[in-house]
């Protein structure tokens, strides 16, 4: 559920890497090497404010191997995860007291991903196994994209359902994935 | 020693198919992606698809789809690619060439296959 | 696509001195800090041979003189100093994007 089979011009299925809200812990060799916002991007929002670090959409990098049943890839790949908050909510004047509050409402702007590159990858596998040629589909950008909710569900449906808009009021948590939901993801391919 | 050996040049006659061989040898055949790539005069070097010979999936530039058909026979570490309804714009030399892990490039290419459409 | 520009179409060096091929793509082919730009040699009769990976990276058997730099979009091949065999037609190609793109060839001749 984490992710879907995306139908590419090939024959081939490549397994879409569903939005990470949060880097999972399980991945090796964490490389957090965290770019310009947005990918060097300017934020894609309709906010005023001076301070960009609220617009945080990351991009980090992870690497680890992709695994096909007992066959691993000769080297780790490098894979982008999309990971933060796109901006506060929209702020609102507070009739009570003259002051100035949060609202979640409005629109909702999620950090996902953007575009995707194939990667090719060389699976070696034991008992004298051939080896097997592989290509897997790796986020390669990251993005602050405007939800409604008119659209936010159809927007996301390529991402997963980590990424439904969280409840009111609610600090939206990422959901954990297990070590093997994440080894799904990478699995296969072309 | 890696190497891809191709089949010979062709002469055709336009509206006609061919079928252009590519004997790999000196490495897992399954282990790599094979990808065939264009040379003519007016359009240097152009990328027209690859396979994986382990799955026989295949990936095709746009602009090829309908004109090439990319096959493996897995049993000679043969790839081939078939061109059909050959005009003469298709006239031009065709490589198969590997696609590599380290370095992440086309690092083995076979010798050419000359494909010459003339009535 | 990613479309990638080469300059100069054609040059002339003497031997001994130094040629510079530049190659310029539509968009960045970085990714996770490793530049996807690769350098090929080709000469009349022949396939293309790889010389250059990952912007800078020599490929085996390929002599020092040959050497790659850039990152983003914009990537340089050297020659120096410029041998008799080494009169070509080099071809820039990305690898970062599907699908594989090449330059449009920089034919090196000698003076």
């Known amino acids: 559920q984490g992710w879907q089979a995306f139908k590419n011009d090939a024959t081939e299925i490549i397994p879409e890497l569903g939005e990470y809200p949060e880097p999972p812990p399980e991945l090796e060799n964490n490389k957090t090497m965290n770019r310009a916002e947005n990918g060097g991007r300017p934020p894609h929002h309709p906010f005023e404010t001076k301070d960009v670090s609220e617009y945080s959409c990351r991009e980090l990098h992870f690497t680890r191997y992709v695994t096909d049943g007992p066959c691993r890839s000769a080297k780790p790949v490098t894979e982008l995860v999309c990971s933060g908050q796109c901006g506060p909510a929209r702020l609102l004047p507070n009739a009570i007291g003259r002051g100035k509050w949060w609202r979640p409402s409005g629109p909702d702007f999620r950090c996902i991903p953007d575009r995707y590159r194939a990667q090719r990858v060389q699976l070696l596998c034991p008992g004298g196994e051939a080896p097997r040629a592989r290509k897997v589909r790796l986020v390669a950008s990251c993005k602050c994209k405007r939800l409604t909710r008119f659209h936010n569900q159809s927007e996301l449906k390529d991402f997963g359902t980590e990424a439904a808009r969280p409840q009111k009021g609610r600090k939206p948590r990422p959901r954990a994935r297990s070590a093997k939901a994440n080894q799904a993801e990478l699995e296969n391919a072309y | 020693e890696v190497q891809l050996q191709q089949s010979g040049p062709e002469l055709v006659k336009p509206g006609a198919s061919v079928k252009i061989s590519c004997k790999a040898s000196?490495?897992?055949?399954?282990?790599?992606?094979m990808h065939w790539v264009k040379q003519s005069p007016e359009n240097s070097l152009e990328w027209i698809g690859e396979?994986?010979?382990?799955?026989?999936?295949?990936t095709y530039n746009q602009r090829f789809k309908g004109k090439a058909t990319l096959t493996v026979d897995k049993s000679s570490s043969t790839a081939y690619m078939q061109l059909k309804s050959l005009t003469s714009e298709d006239s031009a030399v065709y490589y198969c060439?590997?696609?590599?892990?380290?370095?992440?490039?086309?690092?083995?290419w076979g010798q050419g296959t000359s494909v010459t459409v003339s009535s | 696509d990613i479309v990638l520009t080469q300059s100069p179409a054609s040059l002339a060096v003497s031997l001994g001195q130094r040629a510079t091929i530049s190659c310029k793509a539509s968009?960045?082919?970085?990714?996770?800090?490793?530049?996807?730009m690769n350098w090929y040699q080709q000469k009349p009769g022949q396939p293309p041979k790889l010389l250059i990976y990952?912007?800078?990276n020599l490929e085996s058997g390929i002599p020092a003189r040959f050497s790659g730099s850039g990152s983003g979009t914009d990537f340089t091949l050297n020659i120096h100093p410029v041998e008799e065999e080494d009169a070509a037609t080099y071809y820039c190609?990305?690898?970062?994007?599907?699908?594989?793109?090449f330059g449009g060839g920089t034919k090196l001749e000698l003076k």
């Open positions: 396979i994986n010979p382990s799955t026989g999936g295949t």
């Open positions: 968009q960045s082919v970085d990714y996770a800090g490793d530049n996807y």
């Open positions: 000196g490495y897992p055949f399954t282990g790599y992606f």
């Open positions: 190609q990305q690898s970062n994007e599907d699908p594989p793109t």
């Open positions: 990952t912007a800078s």
């Open positions: 060439t590997r696609w590599g892990y380290n370095p992440y490039a086309l690092d083995y």
